[in-house]
Interface confidence: medium
């Protein structure tokens, strides 16, 4: 999977991060979780292996199995937001997943706008994280 | 803000059928999935079956195969539940829910009595 | 099916009380599981999704904790309000499957 190192933006915004997969895993599970450590990260959301977007809260996902590419989109940020996310495929065996850094700036601080991935903050995923799903 | 706002009580007869309605707004509806919920006299919940918005796909709990028919108006936001040859232990109240875990209709309530 | 254990059908506790609301899977449902609150004559609304998520505008008084078949809804500071029916949910597997409710009642 590939997916933005990092993505910031403000306060009571919103964020959009894209997540890249390859040929094969079209029909699975995709899922969107929180937490440093990638074996006891919390899924927010998930996909149920077709097309159709979920949306939970104030967190949704949708998978272009065509583009081979799900996003996920969290609004109405708040500062404790903050923290390590995952873009992640279930699958038979360990997990695919890839790490990103959800950076909120405080109201009224300087902030740029929430960036979306670029060529520059992609980090392809080459194996080193590993997650047994349930 | 986003709503969905079900058909109103129904009393039918066993043997009959019925259509409740369950309109979306406030969202774009082929965005996410609907399901359907059915809570007896009892309060005992149960799932129904979820329904893919984009094609109109349902993924039906075994129960609930057979006499029930989900399906989808997208022109007017609206999903439907038709219920065949009705008897009594259907008798319930029928909830439509978006994505399940999140927004509720505010429920139908469907009488089955001879 | 998953079958979803609420052992207790009814509460009873005073304001200002914490109170905990118990739910055992059958099988291993990971953390995938919400808790729903129905009062009389209204409509389940979703108060925790992913075992201990909050839903936007649900008050801090209400905890969701749990992984794996255990799972509990931890109310802190329980207020009249909070008069009602509990019910765990699990999305884990097809068919989803409720508990079967825990009422609250308030001495």
């Known amino acids: 999977i590939q997916g933005p190192e990092s993505v910031r933006a403000p306060e009571q915004g919103s964020l959009t991060v894209q997540c890249h997969y390859k040929q094969g895993w079209e029909t699975y599970i995709k899922w969107w979780c929180r937490g440093v450590r990638w074996d006891t990260c919390k899924i927010l959301i998930e996909t149920r292996g077709s097309e159709q977007g979920e949306k939970s809260d104030r967190v949704s996902i949708k998978d272009n199995q065509k583009d081979r590419t799900f996003t996920v989109t969290m609004e109405g940020l708040r500062r404790d937001d903050a923290d390590v996310y995952w873009c992640g495929i279930e699958r038979r065996g360990p997990d695919l997943g890839t790490q990103v850094k959800v950076i909120v700036d405080p109201e009224g601080a300087a902030s740029t706008t929430a960036s979306s991935p670029t060529n520059s903050n992609m980090a392809v995923f080459i194996g080193s994280h590993k997650r047994n799903h349930y | 803000q986003i709503q969905l706002v079900q058909s109103g009580p129904e009393l039918k007869k066993p043997g009959e059928t019925v259509k409740i309605s369950c309109k979306a707004s406030g969202y774009t509806f082929t965005d996410y999935s609907l399901h359907w919920v059915k809570q007896t006299p009892e309060k005992n919940l149960k799932w129904m079956a979820w329904?893919?918005?984009?094609?109109?796909?349902?993924t039906y709990a075994d129960d609930f195969k057979g006499r029930f028919a989900f399906s989808l108006e997208t022109s007017s936001n609206t999903a439907y539940l038709l219920i065949n040859n009705l008897k009594n232990e259907d008798t319930a109240t029928y909830f439509c829910?978006?994505?399940?875990?999140?927004?509720w209709g505010q429920g139908t309530t469907l009488t089955v009595s001879s | 099916d998953i079958v979803m254990t609420q052992s207790q059908k009814f509460m009873s506790t005073s304001v200002g009380d914490r109170v905990s609301v118990t739910c055992k899977a059958s099988?291993?449902?990971?953390?995938?599981v919400a808790w729903h609150q129905q009062k009389p004559g209204q409509s389940p609304k979703t108060l925790i999704y992913?075992?201990?998520y909050r839903y936007s505008g649900v008050p801090d008084r209400f905890t969701g904790s749990g992984s794996g078949t255990e799972f509990i809804l931890t109310i802190s500071n329980v207020q009249s309000e909070d008069l009602a029916e509990y019910f765990c949910?699990?999305?884990?597997?097809?068919?989803?499957?409720f508990g079967g409710g825990t009422k609250l009642e308030i001495k």
């Open positions: 329904i893919n918005t984009e094609t109109g796909a349902p």
């Open positions: 829910a978006l994505t399940m875990v999140n927004y």
């Open positions: 099988q291993n449902v990971g953390i995938r």
């Open positions: 949910q699990q999305y884990n597997s097809y068919p989803y499957t």
């Open positions: 992913s075992t201990s």
